[in-house]
């Protein structure tokens, strides 16, 4: 499995962000596919569970991401993206996307460095 992410993402406090993660695999996508999203905070604290997908999407039942994350992927299109709502400044950090698609071997975990800012920089307005 090979994973592709946007690497760096800047988003405005209070808005929603799509954390894009796509993948390729020599094995067909089926019921064995799993996607795990985790979060490493900037302060170096323990990694946190964000989201899990296996046949169905599953939000965390506890913690900072409870009721703030949803599935925005499409496995048939090799898309494992999620939506993170109501961004806060302490959402700053690294989000990891891990895709397993047996019998394909696990690949390198994808990473997105999210920066939550007060206002978007002018140079990035055309991306919105």
């Amino acid at each position: 499995v090979e994973i592709y992410t946007s690497r760096v993402l800047e988003a405005v406090n209070g808005t929603d962000a799509r954390l894009k993660c796509t993948f390729s695999s020599f094995a067909p996508v089926g019921d064995a596919l799993t996607v795990t999203w985790n979060f490493r905070p900037l302060d170096g604290g323990p990694e946190q569970f964000v989201f899990y997908y296996h046949i169905d999407p599953f939000q965390p039942m506890s913690g900072r991401f409870k009721d703030r994350v949803s599935w925005d992927g499409n496995p048939e299109r090799y898309d494992a993206s999620i939506l993170l709502w109501k961004l806060q400044f302490d959402d700053n950090g690294t989000y990891t996307c891990q895709v397993k698609n047996p019998p394909d071997v696990d690949g390198v975990i994808g990473e997105i460095r999210l920066s939550v800012v007060h206002t978007v920089r002018f140079s990035e307005i055309h991306f919105l």
Epitope: T36, N38, F49, D56
Partner: antibody, heavy 116, light 106 residues
Framework: QVQLVQSGSELKKPGASVKVSCKAS????????MHWVRQAPGQGLEWMGE????????DYNEGFTGRFVFSVDKSVSTAYLQISSLKAEDTAVYYC?????????WGQGTLVTVSS | DIQLTQSPSFLSASVGDRVTITCRAS?????MYWYQQKPGKAPKPLIY???NLASGVPSRFSGSGSGTEYTLTISSLQPEDFATYYC?????????FGQGTKLEIK
């Protein structure tokens, strides 16, 4: 490194109250919800509930409402479990634990013994 | 509440053995956690969300499953693996634990 240090063992009489503390260090206290788990002697694990240290919001498991109260003091990065009107069946080890990718970090446990 | 039933409840095995513990849920759950507990100690996480190894856990431990049936496998038992193992679901509130599987030296 992350540490959760709980207060020492308690021996209480039925009807009394007890307050167990859990002092957190090595991480940002408000970033992780604190959970409480009970283990009666020789028995399995039972999730009691959780508290959000940021705003004090709580979620209690059925069976742990009324006599059980979770609280936090952010200024000293400490969570508390208070049990009132103690009964013999409250005799157990009480653990605090934080949810990260799982219940990854645990206190050493506090044995509360209720006996007349 | 979702009930988790582990089998077996007790298991005798020898160093080097391959061991599998099963956890069955009363209704479908999305993922499973596994913990190891030694006498007088707090539980230690082994597996999170079904198949991911917790930090510092040796690769001889693995998890799998879906729906109502999940398994924890230890590929080659080591002396330090003799303990009690618990499964836990948290894809539905409240989180619940299995009754435990005590793994003893044969």
């Amino acid at each position: 490194q992350v540490q959760l240090v709980q207060s020492g063992s308690e021996l209480k009489k039925p009807g009394a109250s007890v307050k167990v503390s859990c002092k957190a260090s090595g991480y940002t206290f408000t970033n992780y919800w604190m959970h409480w788990v009970r283990q009666a002697p020789g028995q399995g694990l039972e999730w009691m509930g959780e508290i959000n240290p940021t705003n004090g919001g709580t979620d209690y498991n059925e069976g742990f409402t009324g006599r059980f109260v979770f609280s936090v003091d952010k200024s000293v990065s400490t969570a508390y479990l208070q049990i009132s009107s103690l009964k013999a069946e409250d005799t157990a080890v009480y653990y605090c634990t934080i949810y990260t990718t799982a219940l990854d970090y645990w206190g050493q446990g506090t044995l509360v013994t209720v006996s007349s | 509440d979702i009930q988790l039933t582990q089998s077996p409840s007790f298991l005798s095995a020898s160093v080097g053995d391959r061991v599998t513990i099963t956890c069955r849920a009363s209704s479908s759950v999305g993922y499973m956690y596994w913990y190891q507990q030694k006498p007088g100690k707090a539980p230690k996480p082994l597996i999170y969300v079904t198949s991911n190894l917790a930090s510092g856990v040796p690769s001889r431990f693995s998890g799998s499953g879906s729906g109502t049936e999940y398994t924890l496998t230890i590929s080659s038992l080591q002396p330090e693996d003799f303990a009690t193992y618990y499964c836990q679901q948290w894809s539905s509130n409240p989180p619940t634990f299995g009754q435990g599987t005590k793994l003893e030296i044969k």
